[in-house]
């Protein structure tokens, strides 16, 4: 077995691979020159196609193996990886989808930025909706519970549909779903707050088709380098769609003079998104970049993959990880405004608020150092996962862990800050955020390291359902609720309040710390599982009959 | 059976303060919204000031002819809303009605389902 | 603001007549328009809520239509006990706003 790590590590950039790509072609060119119309040509034909003993497979991290060979013209023989389809027909090899590859994933990065921009055009005017409609704090809890709870049960359904049907035609199903149904909750009569409820969790069905499925064709257009670049360029969406839908929300309401109209912009720009996905997002199949083709289609019974993936421990502690991020992200974007604003109660910087919004002005400049930290957090991540890859090869969950545990540090700061100085709590916010959004997309990467191509999409569900459960689902109550606990044994006063809410934040530091913990338990069987992986890789592009899985 | 019985009004010269109290049974008054709504003599209704519940943060509103100068509150433990007015001109004489919302839990309407008797505000010097 | 116009400001019609009262918004403010009765030095009370909706206890020869800005009120066969004054309310926006009202008066 090659040392797959170090493939990793040898080829130092995109560029490399590109031109590792390149000899790989024109070695396939020239073979296809003696064979005549291509390596399956033959059999296309309905003749015997002869595979040439040096065929070659790229695997899960890009590196170059001698394939096993089959009996002549056996479906699945490598070099026959892609079973043709017709006389003469050939399945394109990634290398040469060229820009073409870069354009979907541009594409896809731009459908994600959708997906949070309609998910923060709704926050961007949650005053106003709950204004309009009447709605008590507890329906705005309402709307987003439903929310939650329907693209987490969601998830795994698509989860499953992604690793067997065309992900190029859900997606679009799905951008094409949750546009309509925006759209149409703009004109949801003041009465109908049940349909509101219901069109946010309709939204949540369609938006969770998206992230559970758009990963997992960027895992199969790219690999090594170029992927964890890509799956930056695509989580970066998240922080940006996010700053972006508070902007579209605002700022259309006050162009219109309405608020309707905010929840009008980004359905006519999904439609858009949609169409272009079904028209440049090529129909990759899953393995593409790994050189498997058409080979690749589940095979195996959703509970089997469930039990894989279960057994599968790099996925199974970096899914906690990402729930330990989840949990911290959920509780501070919805504590942290009223916190700073209880801080300056108690700097005597800010008067009791009595009437709502409280904090609009921390919440405003909270929104854009998360957006801008996202930015920051996933391009340092990329960058110095790209470094460490030269020296160890756990890099990935290694640069992740640190990343954590530096954050929980800062996190901590931040309550001790904030009782003297907003500006020194603001600067741990950022430094803490930016280490915290660091492993975005390292943890995609890791997923697509060790989860086979035709497992990716039900285990990015199956993350997405546990981060949101164990995650943001519960963490903003479950603060709430230990800040009240505290607040009904102490006297009433505003620096009670200020420090009930922070004693009840100190909560995640401490889950922070166990993320990092979890990373650290994802290096110590990262290099096995990957390896494992790649075998199970190298097995599905041979005849089914040996496929043990 | 609901009942809303405002008490406090009065004769008062502009200038002076006054405050209506409305005493509530019936209901769920805890979790109900409740409005003020005034009508000069002769003259249509007009709404005045709005409070909302505890799971709404005790948020107030208030027309633009008030705000600044009538401030409206709320004892949920004693079922009664307030109305204290400030600085009272003459166009304040009015019959106030003391108002409550139809309560649906998770949200509220801003249709007023049951009214007061109302209590004669008259300002003149 | 949003700005109501009631019309006619009176009515005259006979006993068992049907009438429709009109209410005209300033913009576009959907079905949220409630319609109020108010008798002679008594209070309101609501007789449709979002522009078509009834009301348990009131009467069912009075309904409600509309959406957008027009808005009508009619009553089936006026009885001698609906001779008031009907005022709309809008609760698409504050603050809430009332119509100027429409006396309805025995001919």
């Known amino acids: 077995m090659m040392c797959l790590e170090c493939a990793s590590a040898a080829a130092g950039g995109a560029e490399e691979e590109e031109a590792d790509a390149e000899r790989r072609r024109r070695r396939r060119g020239a073979q296809r020159g003696a064979g005549g119309s291509g390596c399956c040509g033959a059999r296309g034909a309905g003749g015997a196609g002869v595979s040439a003993a040096g065929d070659e497979v790229q695997t899960l991290s890009g590196s170059v193996r001698r394939a096993p060979t089959g009996p002549p013209g056996t479906p699945g023989t490598p070099g026959c990886a892609a079973t043709a389809k017709g006389p003469g027909a050939q399945q394109p090899k990634p290398a040469s989808l060229g820009r073409g590859r870069g354009a979907a994933a541009a594409i896809l990065s731009l459908g994600n930025v959708l997906n949070y921009l309609d998910r923060y055009t709704v926050a961007g005017v949650l005053l106003d909706i709950q204004q309009h409609f009447g709605v008590k704090d507890r329906g705005a809890g309402l709307l987003q519970s439903v929310f939650i709870c329907s693209f987490m049960v969601a998830a795994p359904i698509f989860g499953y549909l992604g690793d067997r049907f065309n992900r190029k035609v859900i997606l679009s199903c799905g951008i094409f779903f949750w546009s309509a149904v925006t759209f149409s909750s703009s004109f949801i009569p003041q009465q109908y707050f049940w349909l509101l409820v219901l069109s946010r969790g309709l939204v949540g069905i369609g938006e969770a088709s998206y992230s559970t499925i758009a990963p997992t064709i960027i895992g199969d257009l790219f690999t090594k380098n170029t992927r964890t670049l890509m799956l930056s360029v695509f989580y970066f969406a998240i922080p940006l769609g996010s700053g972006l839908g508070y902007i579209t929300g605002s700022s259309v309401k006050q162009a219109a003079g309405d608020w309707h109209w905010a929840l009008r912009v980004s359905p006519v720009l999904g439609m858009i998104t949609g169409t272009l996905i079904l028209i440049l997002v090529p129909a990759t199949k899953r393995g593409h970049a790994d050189q498997l083709g058409d080979q690749l289609k589940a095979r195996t019974s959703w509970l089997r993959d469930m039990k894989a993936l279960i057994r599968n421990r790099s996925y199974v502690f970096s899914s906690l990880a990402t729930s330990a991020v989840s949990f911290a992200t959920g509780a501070l974007g919805m504590w942290i405004p009223l916190y700073l604003h209880r801080a300056q109660v108690v700097q005597k910087t800010a008067e009791t608020c009595n009437s709502p919004p409280c904090g609009a002005k921390d919440s405003l400049i909270f929104g854009a150092i998360t957006c801008f930290t996202g930015f920051l957090g996933v391009v340092t991540g990329a960058g110095a996962t790209r470094w460490c890859r030269l020296k160890t090869q756990r890099a990935d969950p290694l640069v992740c862990a640190v990343g954590m545990l530096g954050s929980a540090i800062f996190i901590c700061l931040i309550f001790v800050a904030a009782k003297s100085s907003i500006v020194g709590a603001y600067i741990c916010i950022f430094v803490g955020e930016t280490l915290l959004f660091s492993n975005w997309a390292i943890t995609a990467d890791i997923l697509m390291y060790v989860v086979i191509p035709t497992r990716r999409a039900t285990a990015v569900a199956l993350q997405s359902f546990t981060s949101h459960l164990l995650g943001d689902a519960g963490s903003p109550y479950l603060i709430g609720f230990i800040s009240d606990l505290i607040r009904q044994s102490t006297k009433d006063s505003p620096l009670w309040e200020f420090l009930s809410l922070g004693y009840a934040l100190m909560l995640c530091p401490f889950v922070v710390v166990l993320g990092g913990m979890f990373f650290l338990a994802t290096a110590l069987f990262f290099v096995s599982d990957r390896a494992r992986a790649e075998q199970q890789v190298n097995q599905l592009a041979m005849p089914p009959a040996s496929v043990k899985v | 059976e609901v009942q809303l019985v405002e008490t406090g009004g009065g004769l008062v010269q502009p200038g002076s303060s006054l405050k209506l109290s409305c005493a509530t049974s019936g209901f769920t008054f805890s979790d109900t919204w409740m409005s003020w709504v005034r009508q000069a003599p002769g003259k249509g209704l007009e709404w005045v000031a709005l409070?909302?519940?505890?799971?709404?943060?005790?948020?107030?509103n208030y027309a633009e002819s008030v705000k600044g100068r009538f401030t409206i509150s709320r004892d949920d433990s004693k079922r009664r809303v307030y109305l204290q007015m400030f600085t009272l001109r003459d166009q304040d004489t009015a019959t106030y009605y003391c108002?409550?919302?139809?309560?649906?839990?998770?949200?509220?309407?801003?249709?007023?389902?049951?009214w007061g008797h109302g209590v004669m505000v008259t300002v003149s010097s | 603001d949003i700005v109501l116009t009631q019309s006619p400001a009176t009515l005259s019609v006979t006993p068992g007549e049907s009438v429709s009262l009109s209410c005209r918004a300033s913009?576009?403010?959907?079905?949220?328009i409630h319609w109020y009765q108010q008798k002679s030095n008594g209070s309101p009370r609501l007789l449709i809520k979002?522009?078509?909706q009834s009301i348990s206890g009131i009467p069912s020869r009075f309904s409600g239509s509309g959406s957008g800005t027009d808005f009508t009120l009619r009553i089936n066969r006026v009885e001698s006990e609906d001779f008031s004054v009907y005022y709309c309310?809008?609760?698409?926006?504050?603050?809430?706003?009332f119509g100027s009202g429409t006396r309805l008066e025995i001919k």
């Open positions: 309310q809008q609760t698409y926006s504050l603050p809430l706003t």
């Open positions: 108002t409550s919302h139809e309560d649906f839990y998770y949200y509220s309407s801003y249709y007023f389902d049951y």
């Open positions: 409070i909302k519940d505890k799971n709404s943060n005790y948020e107030a």
């Open positions: 913009q576009g403010i959907s079905t949220s």
């Open positions: 979002y522009a078509s």
